[in-house]
Every structure is written in structure tokens, then in C-alpha cells.
């Protein structure tokens, strides 16, 4: 329900990295937040990772994330590593204010985030 | 302690007015977006609307059953939500409650249109 | 607008069974689904947000799970007091934030 802002389009590096800045509006003074990113394909959602932090501290996804990001105020900026061609698709921005209440949650519009794989290297004869 | 109180309920004639009082204390009224909740006698809850905060320029949203008949307004310097009631049908006979997000809920105030 | 079906209508379980509720929305709400409970003639109550989340003071017998367009709510072990009737909630802007019907769950 709160408004949450995100690119409508990203394309990743060569190297398989995606980074984009999800922004929300706070109706209130939270100092708890948690940040999802689901990925949608069709009808079907998945969570790709998630972290809650408390406001003025860094966000920190759990070891094995594919995902790292920095929070300032109330933007936070993502990044998700280890993309292929195959992942290609809508990621979404999913903010919780957890506390204090009231629980506030918003959904961004998604990031279509294209991945292109690196042509393999031609074999050079020197 | 947190206390949401609705006043302002009663019995009134179909095509008249009624204006619902929702008065909050025991946490930060003006964090909250206030949403208005009826329950018709025998039935289930159906939300009625909501008017968001300052940050949300006080935007207000209605369910289709009154959008044109209903108004949510809300004064933060005396913390205290409204909701007007005109053109009232005996379909708008419930117990409406106020509720601050959706966390915290009053005892509800009962309305009964009937000629 | 986003409709929410609830099933079942109403159940009737033993203390200690496991009682699951469902909720089914009719698009995608990405787990913006609250839970309540209604005792009778009281006043209802939260009882978990954002599709998983225990609110203050619940016992932890009731949790919530699902995302996407199906959502559960289950009881772990039924007691007497859990007698009410339950709420599903879409909470995803833009509103209507519909209510679903209800489910009404007694003791055997």
C-alpha cells in the first residue's frame, strides 16, 4: 500500500550483475524495515532474497545471497550477482515497515532486468 | 495503552445523515492511515475506506457500496477520524469500526437505518 | 477489483487437531494478506500480517504461510478459546482492501 519506486528497466554487466535503487514513501517513522525482491514469471512468484534493517544501519542479506544493497533513508540501493540469460525477468521490490506499527507494505512495479551471456572467447593462435 | 473510540451511531431514516466520530489516543495518530470497517448484523467484516497521512496528501479510497455517498476526513491536531454518511440505505445498517492501520481496532459504534 | 475467496465457510475440529484455512485471491498480491479473529461479540483482533507474520501477543499455534495468490492459516493444535471466526484481508494498494467471507470454527 505505501508507494515504492523502482526502474522500469535494467540490463546486466557482462559479468552477471544487476544493481537498481528501490525508493518508498514512509507514511510513518519505522526503524525496522524489510526489503524483499521476488522474481515474477507468469502467474508465478519467488522470493530471490530478503533482509530486514534497522534504519540508520547497513542491510545485510544472509551469507549465501545472491543479493547485496546499501540503505539510505528511504532508499535502498540492490544489487544481485551471479545472473545468467536464463534469469531474465521482472524483479520486484517488495518494502515491509515491521516496526513500530502500524505494518505498512508497498510493491513496487518491477525491474525487468536483462541478462545477455558473454560470448565465449575465440581461441586466439599467436 | 492504545484506544480508538467511535461515537456518534444511532438510528436514522433511509435517505438521511449521519457523521461517525473516531477519537485515538495511546499512539501516533498521524502515522497511521485510518480505514472505517462495517459489520452488518449476521454477517461478515466489509471494509468500508480509508484516508492515508500527510506524506499521502490525506488521499482518501471508498468501496464501491458508498464511494459517492461517504466521505473519510481526519482532523491530527485533535486526533480524530470521521466518516459522513449521506443519501443512507437500510443496507448501511451495521457496526462500524474505525481502525488505525489494521493493527488497532475500536469497539465499534452501531448504525441502524430503519423508517 | 481483487477478489478474496475463504474455504472453507465453516469447520468443526477437536481440541488439539490441526486446522488449516485457505485463502485464495483472485490475482497475484505478493503476500499483502492480513489474518484476523472475531470472537463472538467481540471486537476482531489481528492475528498475522503480511501473509506470515504473528502479531503482538498471538500464540505461536497460529501461523500464516503462502505467497502469490494462496494463502493458509493454520491452527497447530485447536483450543477451546480459538472459537471465532476468521478473516482473510488483501492489503495491496490500490484499495478496496476486501475482506473475505469468513471462516466460523467450532469444537467437536
Known amino acids: 500500500a505505501m508507494h515504492v519506486a523502482q526502474p522500469a528497466v535494467v540490463l546486466a554487466s557482462s559479468r552477471g550483475i544487476a544493481s537498481f535503487v528501490c525508493e518508498y514513501a514512509s507514511p510513518g517513522k519505522a526503524t525496522e524495515v524489510r526489503v524483499t525482491v521476488l522474481r515474477q514469471a507468469d502467474s508465478q512468484v519467488t522470493e530471490v532474497c530478503a533482509a530486514t534493517y534497522m534504519m540508520g544501519n547497513e542491510l545485510t542479506f544472509l551469507d549465501d545471497s545472491i543479493c547485496t544493497g546499501t540503505s539510505s533513508g528511504n532508499q535502498v540501493n540492490l544489487t544481485i550477482q551471479g545472473l545468467r540469460a536464463m534469469d531474465t525477468g521482472l524483479y520486484i521490490c517488495k518494502v515491509e515497515l515491521m516496526y513500530p506499527p502500524p505494518y505498512y507494505l508497498g510493491i513496487g512495479n518491477g525491474t525487468q532486468i536483462y541478462v545477455i551471456d558473454p560470448e565465449p572467447c575465440p581461441d586466439s593462435d599467436f | 495503552e492504545v484506544q480508538l473510540v467511535e461515537s456518534g451511531g444511532g438510528l436514522v431514516q433511509p435517505g438521511r445523515s449521519l457523521r461517525l466520530s473516531c477519537t485515538a489516543s495511546?499512539?501516533?495518530?498521524?502515522?497511521?492511515?485510518m480505514n472505517w470497517v462495517r459489520q452488518a448484523p449476521g454477517k461478515g467484516l466489509e471494509w468500508v475506506g480509508q484516508?492515508?497521512?500527510?506524506?499521502?496528501?490525506?488521499?482518501?479510497y471508498y468501496s464501491d457500496s458508498v464511494k459517492g455517498r461517504f466521505t473519510i476526513s481526519r482532523d491530527d491536531s485533535k486526533s480524530i477520524a470521521y466518516l459522513q454518511m449521506n443519501s443512507l440505505k437500510t443496507e448501511d445498517t451495521a457496526v462500524y469500526y474505525c481502525?488505525?492501520?489494521?493493527?488497532?481496532w475500536g469497539q465499534g459504534t452501531t448504525v441502524t437505518v430503519s423508517s | 477489483d481483487i477478489q478474496m475467496t475463504q474455504s472453507p465457510s465453516s469447520l468443526s475440529a477437536s481440541v488439539g487437531d490441526r486446522v488449516t484455512i485457505t485463502c485464495g485471491a483472485s490475482?497475484?498480491?505478493?503476500?499483502?494478506l492480513n489474518w484476523y479473529q472475531q470472537k463472538p461479540g467481540k471486537v476482531p483482533k489481528l492475528l498475522i500480517y503480511?501473509?506470515?507474520n504473528l502479531a503482538d501477543g498471538v500464540p505461536s499455534r497460529f501461523s500464516g504461510s503462502g505467497s502469490g495468490t494462496d494463502f493458509t492459516l493454520t491452527i497447530s493444535s485447536l483450543q477451546p478459546e480459538d472459537v471465532a471466526t476468521y478473516y482473510c484481508?488483501?492489503?495491496?494498494?490500490?484499495?478496496?482492501?476486501?475482506f473475505g467471507g469468513g471462516t466460523k470454527v467450532e469444537i467437536k
Open positions: 481502525t488505525g492501520g489494521m493493527d488497532y
Open positions: 495511546g499512539f501516533t495518530f498521524s502515522d497511521n492511515w
Open positions: 484516508i492515508r497521512n500527510k506524506p499521502y496528501n490525506y488521499e482518501t
Open positions: 490475482e497475484i498480491i505478493y503476500g499483502a
Open positions: 503480511g501473509a506470515t
Open positions: 484481508q488483501k492489503i495491496l494498494s490500490p484499495p478496496p482492501w476486501t
